[in-house]
Every structure is written in C-alpha cells, then in structure tokens.
C-alpha cells in the first residue's frame, strides 16, 4: 500500500492557482500574478541547466518572445513548440505576438506600431489559436493551428480565478498567465503596476507566477527612479507610451 | 524564508467538527492561495479545495462542498479549514499548500 | 477510482531506468491542462520533482524527467537509487470536474 499516514515533514513546497473551470465562480479574485521567481531559501530556485522553454501559447512566453515550433521542419518532432525570439521590424510574421513589442503583424510582416496597436493576446482578423486536444501538437508548417472565432462563441469567459488554456478563455481585461498548479484568468495589468520583462533568453522559464502583460497604450518599462539600482533590481512598471 | 506552519494532531468523535490552521510567514500572504489537500492512511492525495487568501473567495471540491468551510484572517497570516460532521474515513493528514509549499500536515483522526 | 491511472506498484534495480505513466482523458491531460509530479517519502509531504510535463526545479537531479503524449503523461527516473523508494503522484486538473486531481499514486521500489 502506500504510505501509511504522514507524521512529520518540512514545509514541503510546491502547486499552485484556483480553479473553477471555464465559468470561475463570480468573484473569485486572485491577486495580480506576484510573478515571483524562483528565490532561495528551500524554495526551488532556477532549474538546474536553462533548457528552450516548453509552450502552448504565446502568453507563455516572454514578451520578446512568442510559441512555435524551433524550425519549420522540426513540427513532427513531437509536435513541441519553445518560445522563440521575436522578429523585428520588417521580418515576416504570422500573428501580432511574433513581433518585437512595438511592432504587429499587417499583411505578414513586422511593422511599427505607434501606440500598443494590439495587446499580446489579441486578435488579429479575428482569428484564434487552437491547439486542439493536444496541449503541445503543431500543425505541419510548425505554427499553432488556428480555427476562426465562432468556435469559441458560445464558450463562457473566465472570470478572475478561472483555470484557463489561453486568453481567449477569459473575460475582457484578464489574460490567462501561469499559476504553477495550470493557468488562471488574472487581470491584464494597469498604468504603474510592476510587470515582467524578460531581458535575459529564457528567464521567464523560471516564472511560475506568472504576471499578464501590461493593457493597450502601455509599455513595461523600468521605472524612472530605478535607473541606478543595479540590472538584477530594476523594477518594471506599465508605462504610457 | 517561506514557511506553512499547521497545527497539531486532533482527535474527534464522529458527527463532530474540525479546524485545522495553517499560518503563513516569509512571503506576502494575500498575493497567494492557500490549498488544502488531504492523504488517508495509506492512500493517495485529494484535493479539498482553496482560498484566496486576498479576497476570501473559496472554491470546493465537490465531495466536500456540503461539509467544508475555507477562511482566512490576513492579520495574523492564518489559512483555516473547517470540516463539519465528521465520520471514520475522514480521518487522513490534512496539509495546506501555497501551492509552490507544503505545511507539515495535520493528523485528524475520527474515532468513537 | 482516480481520474488519472497511475500503475500501483513499479520496481527497479538499482542503476536501472523506470517509468511511470500517468494515464487521462480529454478533459484533463488531453485537454492541455499541465501535469506535475511529486515525490513522497514516508512521513513527509509530498516534493515537486516535475512541474509542467516536463521542468525541473533546482536540486532535483536530471535523473528525473517528464514528457507527455496525448491525454497520458510519464516519469522517467534513469540511473535508479535506493533513496527513490517512494510514492509518485501525478497531477491536472480536470474541467468536467472542475477540480484539481491526483493519480492514485505509484510505490516505487528498488530491489536490492
């Protein structure tokens, strides 16, 4: 049998977000992401060798970053997507979130937007990803399948707290971010409030509790009177353009 | 250094109630939710639920709606889980979990 | 019954290479919700080994690994030691429950 009961133990850790399926219970608030990296003390700290960070989406990613399959090739292979860096300007794209932010996707390719044209997340031409029933499957030219929005127009949206896949799961104003236990509708964050960005390639595979990005007109940059601290303790805050 | 600290063992007869407590230091305790998963003697896990640990808002498993009350007091940093009208086969280790940590457990034990 | 199946019992030799699979359904595994995996020695809560299919936190050694297929999830533990010998458990969550769940549970043993 397994273990007979348990008597003593260190404060063990691990698991994390809320739940309540697609429809969440009204209500059920849960905290803007801490967006905690893994620290020291017995907490898990960074993962022992940086691997390519597994995705299904691109919220999964940094906001330099977007999810697809590492070659075009390479879909087969498992069907695994890793966060990419972004393209730049003039590169072409497929959807807005493959471009550096600053930039969205018209016509295929990376062009400037003056103001956040489209938050991470959003529709371009009303189209949605879909990655089916298989969390990490690809479609054969290496990105996500993707499938028009009427599929999704009698799903309830999320509230804050609800387990979700992706963005689209979740109400206006949330995006879907990581929570260690799966993935929760948390608030797209406002003007001033501390955000994550990920400087160094592959950082944000530490994040468990995972911060949305910052909402339309706004950029995460860091905060004016952090400038001297030094690289590791700048903070970030979502700034207007 | 995070830290989940329950207390200790309980022993309660049949058709009473329980209330387990978790107390929470080393981190901001409103930014997180605290989860209450529990292990039978020789058994495997389940989840009771959580509590957001801001707001107060609860979510049940549904074996345990009925019986269950999740609260919280951020002044003292406390998670608490409430199990009314026990029988035999609730007794098991209760732990609660900010979900990256586990407290010790809690050993309640139902016997007549 | 457990909404993820997990085999009750697995063994190994030392040195040798084990897995453990963790078996759902479209509603949990198969619908893209992530898996975790725990480690839990006798009287201990339970350990992360594997978050999210397939990460690792610090300290846990790359013996351990994760992957997944479809609605089925796996451990692979390579170079076996006698201080495996634990239980493992799987967990997802499951949106026709709307819960969290755990496999049943596997007792790893190593053979001496």
């Known amino acids: 049998t397994l273990n007979s009961v348990l008597i003593n133990s260190n404060a063990i850790k691990n698991l994390p977000p809320p739940l309540g399926g697609a429809g969440g219970q009204p209500g059920s608030a849960v905290s803007v992401a801490p967006g905690v990296l893994y620290e020291g003390g017995n907490k898990y700290q960074t993962l022992d060798n940086y691997q390519p960070y597994p995705c299904a989406e691109d919220e999964e990613c940094g906001s330099d970053e977007y999810c697809s399959s590492p070659s075009r090739g390479a879909a087969g292979v498992g069907g695994v997507q890793i966060c990419l860096a972004c393209r730049k300007r003039r590169k072409r794209c497929m959807r807005h979130a493959m471009c550096c932010p600053g930039n969205y996707c018209k016509n295929g390719i990376c062009m400037p937007s003056d103001h956040s044209h489209f938050p991470r997340g959003e529709i371009e031409e009303s189209i949605i990803e879909n990655l089916g029933n298989d969390h990490n499957a690809a479609a054969g030219d290496g990105y996500p399948r993707r499938t028009t929005l009427t599929s999704k127009i009698y799903h309830t949206k999320g509230q804050e707290g609800s387990v979700c896949l992706r963005s689209s799961d979740c109400a206006a104003g949330l995006c879907c971010a990581r929570h260690f236990w799966s993935k929760i509708c948390k608030p797209v964050l406002k003007e001033g409030q501390v955000c994550t960005k990920h400087k160094r390639k592959g950082s944000h595979g530490l994040e468990i509790f995972q911060r949305c990005y910052c909402g339309e007109g706004l950029a995460c940059r860091i905060q004016k009177d952090h400038h001297q601290a030094s690289n590791s303790s700048r903070l970030h805050t979502c700034q207007r353009h | 250094e995070v830290q989940l600290v329950q207390s200790g063992a309980e022993v309660k007869k049949p058709g009473a109630s329980v209330k387990v407590s978790c107390k929470a230091s080393g981190y901001t305790f409103t930014d997180y939710y605290i989860h209450w998963v529990r292990q039978a003697p020789g058994q495997g896990l389940e989840w009771m639920g959580w509590i957001h640990s801001n707001s107060g808002a609860t979510t049940y498993a549904q074996k345990f709606q009925a019986r269950v009350t999740m609260s919280r007091d951020t002044s003292s940093s406390t998670a608490y889980m409430e199990l009314s009208r026990l029988e035999s086969d609730d007794t098991a280790m209760y732990f609660c979990?900010?979900?990256?940590?586990w407290g010790q457990g809690t050993l309640v034990t139902v016997s007549s | 019954q457990s909404v993820l199946t997990q085999p009750p019992s697995v063994s190994g030799a030392p040195g040798q290479r084990v897995t453990i699979s963790c078996t759902g359904s479209s509603s949990n595994i198969g619908a893209g919700y992530d898996v975790h995996w725990y480690q839990q020695l006798p009287g201990t809560a339970p350990k992360l080994l594997i978050y999210g299919y397939s990460n690792r936190p610090s300290g846990v050694p790359d013996r351990f690994s994760g992957s997944k297929s479809g609605a089925s999830a796996s451990l692979a533990i390579t170079g076996l030691r006698p201080d495996d010998e634990a239980d493992y458990y799987c967990?997802?969550?499951?949106?026709?429950?709307?819960?969290?769940?755990f496999g049943g549970g596997t007792q790893l043993t190593v053979l001496s």
């Open positions: 979990s900010r979900e990256d940590y």
């Open positions: 967990q997802s969550y499951d949106n026709s429950l709307s819960s969290y769940v």
